[in-house]
């Protein structure tokens, strides 16, 4: 019986140019992950297998860091970054966990737009 | 539980549209997950078509996307597959499937054959 | 596109057989592996994904390993109603790709 829940980070904003860590935490249950997939709906960003330790998608190698711990850090956010993200638990003898985290990336703030193009 | 069932012509000419419609039961298509057209020509292997999200986003294969469309009705909790100028290539039976989020496929339509001949 | 290269494409076997069907990847797919079957006439059931993970209520008969390109999927002890089909595919990237197929036949 799965008794486990995932809490996320939500939905989380960030600016475009910058970064974000993506984190799942699976807590209620006494069982072993043993692998964590990070995957958007139509593609795998990374994997971390408690044996064979991680694997970064290579679409994305350039611009996501394992970690901290189980997460994932987006770096160089674009808004085509902008979507779902899910974190899928595998565990035993549970079986598998996901949690969802919605990414929203903005363009630099209004006030940084103005002062680049300002005048003296 | 989730249940997939696919409606459509069994007989399609050369040249026309292939529709074809699958109808969810138990899950509303609106709530969560993709929900996919994969195919599977007599005697061969599979084919994964594409996808349309609960959100409504798609998806589809590079090299079937010129005739493909996947679109829904979420007023009928269905979704559909249009595919146009087919051949006697494009004869297989068509499955409808739900993915979970990692990409691989619990739940499936039992399958219907669609023949393209004159 | 990653093309599932699966081996033997047919093999004859006898109940309480132990089976061994082998997948591999055009490149790494780490361990993003499913294992279907698939009877005459019925739409695939889902075994095995991520490469060993058993899905819900399948037999402990079945069971899947490897990373990287090479997959292995298992029947320890093959019963009656095992003489069917079976695929890999990968889900790693889009277009999600299957194996051409093995054919479990009656010795």
């Known amino acids: 019986m799965m008794t486990g829940t995932i809490e996320t980070t939500g939905n989380i904003s960030a600016e475009k140019g910058g970064s974000i860590i993506l984190q799942c935490h699976l807590s209620s249950t006494t069982a072993q992950v043993t692998q964590v997939n990070w995957e958007q709906q139509d593609q795998l960003l990374a994997i971390c297998n408690a044996d064979l330790g991680w694997h970064i998608s290579p679409s994305f190698k350039d611009r996501v860091a394992p970690g901290p711990g189980l997460g994932l850090t987006l770096q160089s956010l674009t808004v085509n970054d902008t979507g779902e993200y899910f974190c899928i638990y595998h565990t035993y003898p549970d079986g598998t966990y996901t949690g969802r985290i919605f990414l929203e990336v903005l363009e630099s703030s209004v006030a940084e737009h103005g002062a680049r193009f300002q005048i003296p | 539980q989730v249940q997939l069932q696919e409606s459509g012509p069994g007989l399609v000419k050369p040249s026309q549209t292939l529709s074809l419609t699958c109808t969810v039961s138990?899950?509303?298509?609106?709530?969560?997950?993709?929900w996919n057209w994969i195919r599977q020509p007599p005697g061969k292997g599979l084919e994964w078509i594409g996808y349309?999200?609960?959100?409504?986003?798609?998806r589809y294969n590079p090299s079937l996307k010129s005739r493909v469309t996947i679109s829904r009705d979420t007023s009928k909790n269905q979704f559909s597959l249009k595919f146009s100028s087919v051949t006697a290539a494009d004869t297989a039976v068509y499955y409808c499937?739900?993915?979970?989020?990692?990409?691989?496929?619990?739940?499936w339509g039992q399958g219907t054959l669609v023949t393209v001949s004159s | 596109d990653i093309q599932m290269t699966q081996s033997p494409s047919s093999l004859s076997t006898s109940v309480g057989d132990r089976v061994t069907i082998t997948c591999k990847a055009s490149?790494?797919?780490?361990?993003?592996v499913a294992w279907y079957q698939q009877k005459p006439g019925k739409a695939p059931k889902l075994l095995i994904y991520?490469?060993?993970y058993r899905y819900t209520g399948v037999p402990s008969r079945f069971s899947g390993s490897g990373s990287g390109t090479d997959f292995t999927f298992t029947i320890s002890s093959l019963q009656p109603e095992d003489f069917a089909t079976y695929y890999c595919?990968?889900?790693?990237?889009?277009?999600?790709?299957f194996g051409q197929g093995t054919r479990l036949e009656i010795k």
């Open positions: 499937s739900r993915k979970y989020y990692g990409s691989w496929f619990p739940y």
């Open positions: 138990g899950y509303s298509i609106t709530s969560d997950y993709a």
């Open positions: 349309i999200s609960y959100s409504g986003n798609t």
């Open positions: 490149q790494d797919v780490f361990t993003a």
């Open positions: 991520s490469a060993s």
């Open positions: 595919q990968q889900h790693y990237s889009t277009p999600w790709t």
